[in-house]
């Protein structure tokens, strides 16, 4: 079995987690992709997913999570904006391929969000603040509700950094809604 590894990000409240999940172009370009959180001893929980079939460079927003699938690059870009302490946890990208079990994209992300001032004088994150200024048009998210029992039967051990994962649920709004937003440059 392939060893599960984690990449750790320590960010401040209000900042943006911005990661990219690499996938095999020929196999998965149009497959539906999802961003999941893994809580200790629980099955992975899907927080957001792309459309089915996944559209190229077409941003989908679910609460504070923005997914953008770049078929020509073979990358799923995931952004979690305006991070909160409760967002701390272990995350992964997966590709849905029913009836087979979801395909996990390496590596998992260990997110640690702490309180405190994130910037330096004059710093800004305009590209993420724009999310809240756009009148959204919403459609229902069609994320599969299942997760294969074989995908994760038990959450992996904590990383060597001894990061704690809070039990509280992630603070997302309108999780069932998809909000389309323009590409951020």
């Amino acid at each position: 079995a392939t060893k599960l590894t984690e990449e750790k990000y320590e960010l401040k409240e209000g900042q943006t987690l911005d990661v990219k999940c690499d996938y095999t172009l020929e196999k998965f370009a149009s497959s539906q992709k999802a961003w999941q959180i893994i809580r200790d001893g629980e099955m992975p929980k899907t927080l957001a997913c792309t459309e089915r079939p996944s559209k190229n460079s077409h941003p989908v927003q679910v609460g504070r999570i923005i997914l953008e699938d770049y078929h020509d690059h073979g990358l799923l870009r995931v952004r979690m904006v305006n991070l909160q302490v409760e967002d701390s946890g272990l995350y992964q990208c997966v590709i849905y391929q029913p009836p087979k079990e979801p395909h996990m994209l390496f590596d998992r992300i260990r997110l640690v969000v702490t309180k405190g001032f994130s910037g330096t004088p004059g710093s800004n994150e305009n590209s993420t603040q724009n999310v809240y200024k756009i009148p959204p048009t919403t459609t229902k998210a069609l994320c599969p509700l299942y997760t294969s029992p074989r995908t994760v039967t038990q959450a992996p051990p904590k990383s060597t950094a001894d990061v704690s994962t809070p039990d509280s649920e992630i603070n997302l709004t309108n999780v069932t809604d998809i909000i389309r937003v323009p590409v951020f440059n």
């Epitope: 392939t2 060893k3 590894t5 990449e7 990000y9 320590e10 960010l11 401040k12 900042q15 943006t16 987690l17 911005d18 990661v19 990219k20 999940c21 690499d22 996938y23 095999t24 172009l25 770049y70 020509d72 690059h73 073979g74 990358l75 952004r79 994209l105 390496f106 590596d107 992300i109 994130s118 800004n124 994150e125 305009n126 590209s127 993420t128 440059n185």
Partner: antibody, heavy 119, light 108 residues
């Protein structure tokens, strides 16, 4: 232990060619994007080229586009950089670097190989 | 292309003192910024990524802050082994990934 070992550098005339290799160990090579980063003598770092892991997508700096080709052999755990039509300004130490899975930042570097382009 | 500008070019500090290095991006890169340390004759070493996350094995005296366009690397109490050149790098979008021109931290 993660290790990256570059080879193939040397002295070449302008217009000539070289092929750099980077043999890696200590991680699942096929899963990770890899980049070449160069440093001209006494100068700063310049990203040259990247090849993604799963997708195999390739990218180049404008300064080398059309002249350099990045490739990888996952069965040999080796990354390559084919450099054609070399110019004097390509003279530099060339480093291969392993990237994070989740972003193009470089967590492990080789020791570098020196490419000198001179007549 | 996103241009990264570091200041100062050279910083003269006494051992035990605090060093503050700056990096500015020509446009917002969120927290997608890394810092590297390079000593003469050696390859660069990753210190900080995601603007503030210390890489594995990096001492706690190194800290990063900032977001958007303005970033800072702070070395709280300089040790003899910290005198080196430091580079920032943005990885916000697709290539090219750009580095700052470097800040040399030298002994005062």
């Amino acid at each position: 232990e993660v290790q990256l070992l570059e080879s193939g550098g040397g002295l070449v005339q302008p217009g000539g060619s070289l092929r750099l290799s980077c043999a890696v160990s200590g991680f699942t090579f096929s899963r990770y994007a890899m980049s070449w980063v160069r440093q001209a003598p006494g100068k700063g770092l310049e990203w040259v080229s990247e090849m993604r892991g799963s997708s195999g997508s390739t990218y180049y700096a404008d300064s080398v586009k059309g002249r350099f080709t990045i490739s990888r052999d996952n069965s040999k755990n080796t990354l390559y950089l084919q450099m054609n039509s070399l110019r004097v300004e390509d003279t530099a130490i060339y480093y291969c670097a392993k990237e994070f899975s989740s972003n193009s930042l470089f967590d492990y570097w080789g020791q570098g190989t020196l490419v000198t382009v001179s007549s | 292309e996103i241009v990264m500008t570091q200041s100062p070019a050279t910083l003269s500090v006494s051992p035990g003192e605090r060093a503050t290095l700056s990096c500015r991006a020509s446009q917002s890169v969120n927290a997608n910024l890394a810092w590297y340390q390079q000593k003469p004759g050696q390859a660069p070493r990753l210190l900080i990524y995601g603007a503030s996350t210390r890489a594995t094995g990096i001492p706690a005296r190194f800290s990063g802050s900032g977001s958007g366009t303005e970033f800072t690397l702070t070395i709280s109490s300089l040790q003899s082994e910290d005198f080196a050149v430091y580079y920032c790098q943005q990885f916000y979008n697709f290539p090219p990934y750009t580095f700052g021109q470097g800040t040399k931290v030298e002994i005062k």
